[in-house]
Amino acid sequence: MMTGTIETTGNISAEKGGSIILQCHLSSTTAQVTQVNWEQQDQLLAICNADLGWHISPSFKDRVAPGPGLGLTLQSLTVNDTGEYFCIYHTYPDGTYTGRIFLEVLESSVAEHGARFQIP
């Protein structure tokens, strides 16, 4: 029976050109984590394998850095990076746990003056 839960950073925003850390944490289970996959919509970003370590997809090598921990750091953010990100924990014997993070990348001025978009 799968008793674990994935805690994520949830919905987050960051500034264009900046960086952001995507973090997931698996709790409430004694299952062994064998591998964690990071995906953006339908693209594999990175894999952290208990035996083999990190593998970053070549097309993301310049902008994705492993860690901290099992997390993933996205750098040189663009507006196109806005969207859903998934951490997929492969565990033994439980199976697969999936967490979701939504990242919104804001134009610099929007990040600085976000209040102007609020309804008075």
Epitope: T34, N49, D51, Y92
Partner: antibody, heavy 118, light 107 residues
Framework: EVQLLESGGGLVQPGGSLRLSCAAS????????MSWVRQAPGKGLEWVSA????????YYADSVKGRFTISRDNSKNTLYLQMNSLRAEDTAVYYC???????????WGQGTLVTVSS | DIQMTQSPSSLSASVGDRVTITCRAS??????LNWYQQKPGKAPKLLIY???SLQSGVPSRFSGSGSGTDFTLTISSLQPEDFATYYC?????????FGGGTKVEIK
Amino acid sequence: EVQLLESGGGLVQPGGSLRLSCAASGFTFSSYAMSWVRQAPGKGLEWVSAISGSGGSTYYADSVKGRFTISRDNSKNTLYLQMNSLRAEDTAVYYCARVPYGYWMDYWGQGTLVTVSS
Amino acid sequence: DIQMTQSPSSLSASVGDRVTITCRASQSISSYLNWYQQKPGKAPKLLIYAASSLQSGVPSRFSGSGSGTDFTLTISSLQPEDFATYYCQQSYSTPLTFGGGTKVEIK
């Protein structure tokens, strides 16, 4: 240099058994999942079975489930496929392959031919 | 099980041609799609993994694209050594499944 060398193929009668071996060298064997893939004469590739690096998890195609058993001896850097209750449709070249990160198969052996015939 | 459908099953082309092979999955497989090349009497060789990542040592004329259900292998300028059979394979879930293959022949 990564090398995979299969052995144990041959001619066997229907209902018989055979054990294939795959000797690995050039990498840390216990860190990698491994897989068996077969190819019937003139046909395409068919995945048969896979096993995790520790040997704790095994996976099988429906066509061989209950008849074939995959195993590994990490102290000997060797992968095995025990094939029982063999059928004519099991006739194929059997390849072992290394499976990094549990997904793609990046290195393959040269294959060993299994012929099931009376 | 996830079915993988490759097209065409065979094609004739000349050296220097741009060749495109397509692979369709029966359900979304994210980017868990790999391409292999096989020559007669030889073991398959990994070309592309995770839909678009070029395996080390593979010439850059090979490229892969796609995500979800539709994928493409492109050879930008066909060379004499590229005449072979090409297979796609999904690694999204077990049982792992291959496409039926595409044989690239000399025109």
